[in-house]
């Protein structure tokens, strides 16, 4: 046969799905790999052909159109199953072709198994909302396309196991779950169960998002270095090892890209020729407000390193800051010599 | 467990147009907490029911209000107190009205479970 | 903004008799409704909550059903005591510019117990 521009198995997209419940799997090609749509490649002669490839098996196989109830069928660039099944994990296909064309690409499939508190191995994806901030919403995902305009599903939204039903400050709104306040309690995986009947069946679509509470943008603050600060002096004598830490509180933000970094004598550790080294941890608190501590490390120090400028500093979107360390040599106590006179008694 | 209604004054909440008041609500018998909303209605003589807004009782206090508010009145609440306030600026004569306290225990369904008795305010010149 | 419309107004039947009261939503609110009774002189009493739950207390022949745009509120075996003014209370959320909360009570329905 002809050659075919293969764009490999493209685990970029890992698809997940739940078993017994209806699918809609578009070919990626056109999504990520060719720069134009399945409309204009089938006004153009191309055919889209699908095929999979069984789980732990290597052998191609044509998918089965004709199985009881269209179970799976393709519509324009979407494969449907209607509903999963489990056997129907493997690896898929879609090719597009003609007499002188040829572009595929396969991604996998994974129908997965949930019990009845909706627990499963599913990546989930996560939902942040900002603490007390005021009303926010998520929305059922990925139901698009599932059932026309015309027909009113039925939505249920669970926290982990438990209907949302006089939730205190929670709204179920359809497809929308409105956090008139979010509060750390409301921290956990929430469901929406979509109902909706297609030719005399009913189908439900389970959707699992986790919401985790994060720092409000009204309370975010710039860096706070909290070390080195006024009241803390380093003194070292020559071939001792001095050690710094600078310890930065960065309020949460979105999207923020959090920095620490030493400069000594206004250049970088990496720009210098002393032997320094430096190590980094991070924590975050509940809000995912995060600390940062950068300890700055110099084993044999010398009495020139004693006179250099330490200089910490941090960035976030608030802001910049910076705080020098108090580094000094420490003076030698004075050695006294005592003369013990004797005999200075009285006669 | 009741709401305990104040405000209005030795004048039993007769205020002259332009004039301000404010009316508290005070919880007995339960704490105000995270766990509650203070909302706040008013019923003008022989009118219907008409929400005016609710403060969230946990720590942030956050509002929300009916748009025809537009400003003029304020929700406040004090934990430590167990009493949330309405505090009503630029009254006019169409402001007449009983003003009702009501604790919300969901504030998604609206389950305003338990009530103040009422302050009646009176705007006239 | 959210508008309520409750129909009718007044409504009247006989001890022992069935009256329904409905509400209508201007959006629809899911079941995100509330019904008080109020008799005069005072404070309005919760009766039903989320559209169909009843509030603890209130007898089993006061029950709501509905959703989305419209609601009913149905008292069977009337009694005379339930002689009172009844309103819906709809309640949704508003994103936008200004993200806010709509609690809109209905213009209220007269009972009448003959």
């Known amino acids: 046969s002809e050659r075919c521009d293969d764009w490999g198995l493209d685990t970029m997209r890992q698809i997940q799905v739940f078993e017994d419940e209806p699918a809609r799997i578009k070919c990626p090609l056109f999504e990520h790999f060719l720069k134009f749509n399945y409309s204009t490649a089938h006004s153009a002669g191309l055919t889209l052909i699908w095929y999979w490839t069984r789980q732990d098996r290597d052998l191609e196989e044509p998918i089965n159109f004709r199985l009881p109830e269209n179970r799976i069928s393709k519509e324009k660039d979407v494969l449907w199953f209607r509903p999963t099944l489990l056997n129907d994990t493997g690896n898929y296909t879609c090719m597009l072709r003609n007499t002188t064309y040829c572009s595929k690409v396969a991604f996998p499939l994974e129908v997965v198994q949930k019990d009845s508190c909706f627990n499963s191995p599913m990546k989930l994806p996560v939902h942040k909302l900002y603490i007390e901030y005021g009303i926010q919403r998520i929305t059922c995902p990925n139901v698009d396309g599932y059932f026309p305009s015309s027909v009113k599903p039925t939505i249920t939204w669970y926290m982990g196991c438990y209907k949302i039903q006089n939730f205190n400050n929670v709204i179920p709104e359809g497809m929308n779950l409105s956090f008139l306040i979010a509060l750390i309690s409301n921290n956990g995986n929430y469901t929406c169960v979509v109902t909706y009947p297609e030719n005399g069946r009913t189908f439900h679509l389970t959707r699992t998002l986790t919401v985790k509470v994060v720092g409000s943008p009204k309370n975010a603050v710039p860096p706070v270095i909290h070390s080195p600060n006024d009241h803390v002096v380093y003194e070292k004598e020559p071939g001792e090892e001095l050690l710094i830490p600078c310890t930065v509180y960065f309020s949460f933000l979105m999207d923020s890209r959090n920095e620490v970094w030493w400069t000594i004598d206004g250049k970088k550790p990496d720009d210098i020729t002393i032997d320094v080294t430096i190590n980094e941890s991070i924590s975050h608190s509940r809000t995912e407000d995060e600390t940062r501590t950068q300890i700055l490390s110099i084993k044999k120090v010398t009495s020139e390193d004693l006179k250099r400028s330490y200089v910490c500093h941090a960035r976030s979107a608030k802001g910049e800051v910076a705080k020098a360390a108090k580094v000094k040599q420490k003076v030698p106590a004075p050695r006294y010599t005592v003369e013990l006179a004797c005999g200075f008694g009285a006669t | 467990q009741q709401l305990e209604q104040s405000g209005g004054g030795a004048e039993g909440g007769l205020v002259k147009p332009g004039g301000s008041l404010e009316l508290c609500c005070k919880a007995?018998?339960?704490?105000?907490?995270?766990?509650?909303?203070i909302c706040w209605v008013r019923q003008a003589p022989g009118k219907g029911l008409e929400w005016i807004g609710c403060i969230y009782a946990g720590s942030s206090g956050i509002t929300y209000y009916a748009s025809w508010v537009s400003g003029r009145f304020t929700l406040s609440r004090d934990i430590d107190q167990s009493t949330g306030c309405l505090q009503l600026n630029s009254l006019t004569a169409a402001d007449t009205a009983m003003y009702y306290c009501?604790?919300?225990?969901?504030?998604?369904?609206?389950?305003?479970?338990?009530w103040g008795q009422g302050t009646l305010v009176t705007v006239s010149s | 903004a959210l508008v309520m419309t409750q129909t009718p107004s007044p409504v009247s039947a006989a001890v022992g008799g069935t009256v329904t009261i409905n509400c209508q939503a201007s959006e629809d609110i899911y079941s995100n409704l509330a019904w008080f009774q109020q008799k005069p002189g005072q404070p309005p009493k919760l009766l039903i909550y989320q559209a169909s739950t009843l509030a603890s207390g209130v007898p089993s022949r006061f029950s709501g059903s509905g959703s989305g745009t419209e609601f009913t509120l149905t008292i069977s075996g009337l009694q005379s005591d339930d002689a009172a003014a009844y309103y819906c209370?709809?309640?949704?959320?508003?994103?936008?510019?200004?993200?806010?909360?709509?609690?809109?009570f209905g213009g209220g329905t007269e009972v009448v117990v003959k």
């Open positions: 209370l709809g309640v949704c959320t508003y994103i936008g510019a200004d993200n806010t909360l709509y609690n809109t």
């Open positions: 007995s018998g339960f704490s105000l907490g995270s766990s509650y909303w």
């Open positions: 009501a604790r919300d225990i969901y504030a998604s369904t609206s389950g305003y479970d338990l």
